[in-house]
Amino acid sequence: GYKAEVMVSQVYSGSLRVLNRHFSQDLTRRESSAFRSETAKAQKMLKELITSTRLGTYYNSSSVYSFGEGPLTCFFWFILQIPEHRRLMLSPEVVQALLVEELLSTVNSSAAVPYRAEYEVDPEGLVILEASVKDIAALNSTLGCYRYSYVGQGQVLRLKGPDHLASSCLWHLQGPKDLMLKLRLEWTLAECRDRLAMYDVAGPLEKRLITSVYGCSRQEPVVEVLASGAIMAVVWKKGLHSYYDPFVLSVQPVVFQACEVNLTLDNRLDSQGVLSTPYFPSYYSPQTHCSWHLTVPSLDYGLALWFDAYALRRQKYDLPCTQGQWTIQNRRLCGLRILQPYAERIPVVATAGITINFTSQISLTGPGVRVHYGLYNQSDPCPGEFLCSVNGLCVPACDGVKDCPNGLDERNCVCRATFQCKEDSTCISLPKVCDGQPDCLNGSDEEQCQEGVPCGTFTFQCEDRSCVKKPNPQCDGRPDCRDGSDEEHCDCGLQGPSSRIVGGAVSSEGEWPWQASLQVRGRHICGGALIADRWVITAAHCFQEDSMASTVLWTVFLGKVWQNSRWPGEVSFKVSRLLLHPYHEEDSHDYDVALLQLDHPVVRSAAVRPVCLPARSHFFEPGLHCWITGWGALREGGPISNALQKVDVQLIPQDLCSEVYRYQVTPRMLCAGYRKGKKDACQGDSGGPLVCKALSGRWFLAGLVSWGLGCGRPNYFGVYTRITGVISWIQQVVT
């Protein structure tokens, strides 16, 4: 029987260049008569052009919605009603070809052509893109607040904020022909619900979305986005009503930056340089293609690529890479943003060198990618450490912490978190190494204590990069490093002359001179610890709520003991900078650390002194009794304590804590507490210090109060941020 043909709506968006007209500012105002008259003429021309081709039978509707420079560019959309079976045959490329063919056929024609009555259309300036009904609806919703801006070379144009009476606005941006646009977005409020989407074309085409950002992101207070060319659209959707713009937008044209390099690496290990996408840290542009060729000096070496918060993964089924495509020695890999460090190790088998390609496969992009490159020894990739095949990183082996996600760094250990005697492979505790008393059968624990040794898990690395065998040699009054660097920066960790955490006791003035009280509007919120003259360390989760993210809210008190009264020894500071660890993850509490820069340096006194920071290799022995301090609640759900409380807790091995917490404990966490509960941190202690006393009498920061199940509950230990796991970030920031 007869079957009616199914027709479908196919939507196209595009632009065309008119050579015999010039753009004027009047055409940016939709309410102007110039705009209305030009739109009517351009619309008529567009319809006539389409209907002059074999597309005419499918023509449904069209609209010219905007104009731009060049001499005059018209931006439009149109809909064709086409039989379903012809849908694929009328791709944007085919439609563009048909229209260009029509334009070319009449260029030298003397015959009267309707669409050429007023306009001389440039066939080379026609662009047709795929669109959808949804895209047109999104575009139409912005037309009441539509801003066109042309930005010239060398200009930085600050865009006028949105019209707050509108619910959505669109900035249509255009720059000089052979340049690319760089948009800068800066969030100016601590919290908002506004949404901004950036497109690589003149209108909000979902398939050409570069990125979208939402709600005054604290993770990215400033975002720079690159278009692939000289046109870009930014769409704003209103969040909460506000009289202040929660963001500032500015745009500038930039030249295309070549992303190709040939490098020959030196005959040395470790990082030798940086490769990055153009205009890093800007988002890479939708048509980025980088090609880096690296030549390795010898086949003894492999090439290592160290990434920050970005990893490479094999992609199944040849699906497109959504976060960047990499090809390394003909292997296709996809980039993936992660909250961890990562290294890709490339074995070198030929002297021809290695070519690394990076391509943005789709229009959706992301933060610029930067990678440190260097060499590693193929026969011993991680001297003294373990190569974690999961993430390519060198991690400490047999230290009692599963640093590698598969835990292989803690497998097959003869001595875990202890020293292995040479004589008979017996294990002795680390504090007994180089303590002047032989504990191994032939005294191998006391050998090489005055000389450099190969670096390993528990060796201390001196400033000159040599290593010493003695565990925890920092600030013990005896120089162990040739350069004396183990005794530098030692004005720390000493208690003042002095004599409620759950199960605790009241502290006295000067007993914990590094203890900080972090307050908002006179109310104690979190603890912290002074680690340098202008830096206080605390937990990142203290700033989890958007309302707590602004530095202006916080006051830091040092030298404080009582919350309800002040004494002469205490001092207060405003916060000039707040830095959360870039890998901090709220849900898992991983990397739960933040640094506060004080508005002026501290003046040290008996009541105000920094705590000592441990080296990455510092070993806090499980079983050791350390102390936590704070003004947190004295019982679960109770009010905070008036007096600074102190309580001793025992350090718990990682594997035991991990079992108790059903494997939610990461290598950046450390556990402490007791079977009986009773002694524990509680609400309000967050970010406060867990300190351990070294044999020298100095106190070292082992952890920060992070999380736990309730307070002082039996069978559940307190979980702390492990300082040795985040020390490299701390040192990077503070120095």
């Epitope: 505790s429 499980p622 079983g623 025992q650 718990i652 035991l656 079977r675 009986k676 509960g677 039996p714």
Partner: antibody, heavy 119, light 110 residues
Framework: QVQLVESGGGVVQPGRSLRLSCAAS????????MHWVRQAPGKGLEWVAI????????YYEDSVKGRFTISRDNSKNTLYLQMNSLRAEDTAIYYC????????????WGQGTLVTVSS | QSVLTQPPSVSEAPRQRVTISCSGS????????VNWFQQLPGEVPKLLIY???LLPSGVSDRFSGSKSGTSASLAISGLQSEDEADYYC???????????FGGGTKLTVL
């Protein structure tokens, strides 16, 4: 490699005293709470006393309170039990036991020393 | 008389599963971690389960512990003749400020 070795047991008359020692090795003695546990012949286990890692806290089973004293010397890695006014019902094997991490009870035990109170 | 109650004896055939209970009160089992010990004839007690349900390294996973409210239990599956021993539960008691042992359960593998 944790080792606990008790000594000092023997036969003693009622009312007399005895001092038990427990030499510890293979772990950092000063980090862990220590206990004495006893077992009368053919009977079950009975806890006697505990001392905290730094010696600051001590607790006793009711029947030995005032007669027994637990102590430790962390510099010598040794645990002691001073038993005074001994009674026949104190006859038992006395074990010294080490707490585990977070004060988990008795993760290692000594071999025990027999104390016999008899006239 | 022990405040922690255990059955004096249990018996089961080889390869079967047996459960030993230990009941106490809120001041001990209800609020603290339970440990289980095995004492083979003529030997020193050995830690079998700690923190209610954790196995020390070297202990067979045929042993498992659990706790609910003021009662705890030890389960042994795939019984073997070498499992014949006395089994004790132990827990800290907050009101006594001391450790309580159960009276012990003698396991016989038939």
């Amino acid at each position: 490699q944790v080792q606990l070795v008790e000594s000092g047991g023997g036969v003693v008359q009622p009312g007399r005293s005895l001092r038990l020692s427990c030499a510890a090795s293979g772990f950092t003695f000063s980090n862990f709470d220590m206990h004495w546990v006893r077992q009368a012949p053919g009977k079950g286990l009975e806890w006697v006393a505990i001392i905290s890692y730094d010696g600051s806290d001590k607790y006793y089973e009711d029947s030995v309170k005032g007669r027994f004293t637990i102590s430790r010397d962390n510099s010598k890695n040794t645990l002691y039990l001073q038993m005074n006014s001994l009674r026949a019902e104190d006859t038992a094997i006395y074990y010294c036991a080490k707490d585990g991490y977070g004060s988990s009870l008795f993760d290692h035990w000594g071999q025990g020393t027999l104390v016999t109170v008899s006239s | 008389q022990s405040v922690l109650t255990q059955p004096p004896s249990v018996s089961e055939a080889p390869r079967q599963r047996v459960t030993i209970s230990c009941s106490g009160s809120s001041s001990n089992i209800g609020n603290n971690a339970v440990n289980w010990f095995q004492q083979l004839p003529g030997e020193v007690p050995k830690l079998l389960i700690y923190y209610d349900d954790l196995l020390p390294s070297g202990v067979s996973d045929r042993f498992s512990g659990s706790k609910s409210g003021t009662s705890a239990s030890l389960a042994i599956s795939g019984l073997q003749s070498e499992d014949e021993a006395d089994y004790y539960c132990a827990v800290w008691d907050d009101s006594l400020n001391g450790v309580l042992f159960g009276g012990g359960t003698k396991l016989t593998v038939l």
